[in-house]
Interface confidence: low
């Protein structure tokens, strides 16, 4: 229904607590250098406005849209050209052009200095002394340097950051209360950011209709006994969400968001047996609960998947009839049959069927044509099936360090170009999926792996967009994104590559590294292993090995000499030459 | 897009008969089970018959057992209920749903039974 002021109404529905939460998110993904106190200003003058309208829905301005209001916020920043550059160029236009303008601004890659945890007392400290201001700090860091961030799980992080706090700062030892449990929400935070920013890019890329068709999938999955018009009315609702909150409409999403969680929780007959303990929870926590609730029990007499996409006499006709909805259904039938399977291996099979049917159907004999359409299913399925039990395989034998050792030596050969930053963070995040992934029941592995990969490969393919080097890797981010993955496990070491020549200073180490934590002493050394493989792209694993060794050997022997200073100044250039004769 | 459009609702004397239809549009008809579902006014939905995609099986609620009659013509893509005996109790909105969905995803016919 329409409402007289849609700011009132987005008020009212959400509370003031989430309203403010969200406003500040808002504006901290679109003016990612702004500080926490402009922004703080902004949303409290906001906040005032929609409490006038509350009160009276027909004041002035009540009934501007809120992309509107928002906007002519973000516009009237002093100093806007100066801090944003082109940015400001986005205020000269009209809704909705100026909203749009201020999505393509969005820089995932924002330069701001990591997000550094305080020490337990000081923290414990100023969370004490003003817990929303606590608080608001924290959606704003992280906001600002994830534009994507899905902010109604931004705000669920922040109450679980709030939870954290809460406990620990009672505690004697408040350090190891808060490092390992602040460290789990961090890195799932983290994750939740490299996904979120995964649809994003499919809705920004691809339109609704592949997310919805991710959709189906992901919730055919994980609701087989829900029938397919109640999967099409989730996907339909759920698509919906996002492409608001990707759209930077963070109010209409956690409002709608929360609407969806509330229909799942009064139809569950329909939908699941699995949801009561989350719809039993508050908001926050119920909607998050969901998205990642356990797969329902699959029904024990489904037929098999030929009956009515293969064997029937009419499958051309119904195909014709509704493509879409009838490759809808094909869709939630194979994904509902198969939880042990990826999202991005179940599009790839239902695009597969899709060309099938396409060429089939216009042919004499279409039953005869795609009669085998699901053996040649097989080499699809076999190929993600592979890469889990190599990948797995060695991560078991390496560990985390040394398999993402591994995967930054084979993506720096598959493209050289690309920044040694960017190499090494993409190796360690892909590097994890073994910790997150190797260590699920067989049946849970390929999803988790196949669906985390994509996800990071994404984030790598938005990097290179901003400054393209490789050929190889433009090649694999200008397809669909469900054959992203697949095309980098195929890229092989770059020919056209011109090695890099060898720079003494570039393997020149100091005694500061010594007291590093030991996260930055392995970006060291993951950033000495690209340069390397930089300069000798065709190295062994073997040479590469010696070299790696040598190096870790001598940072041990220096960081335990009396004058460390002299060590790594009389043993560095010997390490040096070392590595050149052993790449030689 | 699913679509289904049920009629055949009105006002009826106890004891009288309707018989609703459902036309169904945008899926693969004769591929799933279909049901009636009520909702009487104030009341939550009521799962009140159903039928399987080859329309060899149905299944009644005890309330309506004897008095009604789910049935499809597949070939015309569409779902029947024959109500026969009717008590002022079975007044309520009806629709049909895929599967055993109890969520409503059309907007009903009104089934009102009173002398």
């Known amino acids: 229904e329409a409402h007289k002021s849609e700011i009132a109404h987005r008020y009212n529905d959400l509370g003031e607590q989430h309203f403010k939460g969200l406003v500040l998110i808002a504006f901290s993904q679109y003016l990612q250098k702004c500080s926490y106190d402009e922004h703080a200003k902004l949303v409290q003058e906001v906040t005032d406005f929609a409490k006038t309208c509350v009160a009276d829905e027909s004041a002035a301005n009540c009934d501007k849209s809120l992309h509107t209001l928002f906007g002519d916020k973000l516009c009237a920043i002093p100093n806007l050209r100066e801090n944003y550059g082109e940015l400001a160029d986005c205020c000269t236009k009209q809704e909705p052009e100026r909203n749009e303008c201020f999505l393509q601004h969005k820089d995932d890659n924002p330069s701001l200095p990591p997000f550094e945890r305080p020490e337990a007392e000081a923290m414990c400290t100023s969370f004490k002394e003003n817990p929303t201001t606590f608080m608001g700090h924290y959606l704003h860091e992280v906001a600002r340097r994830h534009p994507y961030f899905y902010a109604p799980e931004l705000l669920y992080y922040a109450e679980q950051y709030n939870e954290i706090l809460t406990q620990c700062c009672a505690e004697a030892d408040k350090e190891s209360c808060l490092t390992p449990k602040l460290d789990g929400v961090k890195e799932k935070a983290l994750v939740s950011s490299v996904r979120q920013r995964m649809k994003c890019s499919s809705m920004q890329k691809f339109g609704e209709r592949a997310f919805k068709a991710w959709a189906v999938a992901r919730l055919s999955q994980t609701f087989p006994n829900a029938d397919f018009a109640e999967i099409t009315k989730l996907a339909t609702d759920l698509t919906k969400v996002n492409k608001e909150c990707c759209h930077g409409d963070l109010l209409e999403c956690a409002d709608d968001r929360a609407e969806l969680a509330k229909y799942m929780c009064e139809n569950q007959a329909t939908i699941s047996s699995k949801l009561q303990t989350c719809c039993d929870k508050p908001l926050l926590k119920k909607a998050h609960c969901l998205s990642e609730v356990e797969h329902d029990t699959m029904p024990a007499d489904l037929p098999a998947i030929a009956a009515d996409f293969v064997e029937d006499q009419e499958v051309c006709k119904n195909y014709a009839e509704a493509k879409d909805v009838f490759l809808g259904t094909f869709l939630y039938e194979y994904s509902r049959r198969h939880p042990d399977y990826s999202v991005s291996l179940l599009l790839r099979l239902a695009k597969k069927y899709e060309a099938t049917l396409e060429k089939c159907c216009a042919e004499a004999n279409p039953p005869a044509c795609y009669g085998t359409v699901l053996a040649e299913f097989q080499p699809l399925v076999e190929e993600p099936k592979n890469l889990v039990k190599t990948n797995c395989d060695l991560y078991e034998k390496l560990g985390e360090y040394g398999f993402q050792n591994a995967i930054l030596v084979r993506y720096t050969q598959k493209a050289p170009q690309v920044s040694t930053p960017t190499l090494v963070e993409a190796a360690r995040n892909l590097g994890r999926v073994g910790t997150k992934c190797c260590t699920l029941p067989e049946d849970q592995r390929l999803p988790c792996v196949e669906d985390y990969l994509s996800a990071i490969l994404n984030r790598v393919c938005l990097l290179h967009e901003k400054t393209p080097v490789s050929e190889h890797v433009t090649k694999c981010c200008s397809g669909s994104l469900v054959e992203r993955r697949p095309c980098f496990s195929a890229l092989t070491v770059d020919e056209t590559y011109v090695p890099k020549e060898f720079k003494a200073e570039t393997f020149t180490f100091h005694s500061d590294i010594c007291t590093l934590p030991e996260k930055e002493k392995q970006i060291k050394k993951q950033t000495a292993l690209a340069e390397l493989v930089k300069h000798k792209p065709k190295a062994t694993a073997e040479q590469l090995k010696t070299v790696m060794d040598d190096f870790a050997q001598f940072l041990d022997t220096c960081c335990k000499a009396a004058d460390k200073d002299t060590c790594f100044s009389t043993e560095g250039p010997n390490l040096v030459t070392r590595c050149k004769d052993a790449l030689a | 897009e699913v679509q289904l459009l049920e009629s055949g609702g009105g006002l009826v004397q106890p004891g009288g008969s309707l018989r609703l239809s459902c036309a169904a549009s945008?899926?693969?008809?004769?591929?799933?089970?279909m049901s009636w579902v009520r909702q009487a006014p104030g009341k939550g939905p009521e799962w009140v018959s159903s039928?399987?995609?080859?329309?060899?099986?149905?299944l009644y609620a005890d309330s309506v057992k004897g008095r009604f009659t789910i049935s499809r013509d597949n070939s015309k893509n569409t779902l029947y209920l024959q109500m026969n005996s009717l008590r002022p109790e079975d007044t309520a909105v009806y629709y049909c749903?895929?599967?055993?969905?109890?969520?409503?995803s059309s907007q009903g016919t009104l089934v009102t039974v009173s002398s």
């Open positions: 945008g899926f693969t008809f004769r591929s799933f089970g």
């Open positions: 039928i399987s995609g080859s329309g060899s099986d149905t």
């Open positions: 749903t895929i599967g055993g969905s109890l969520s409503r």
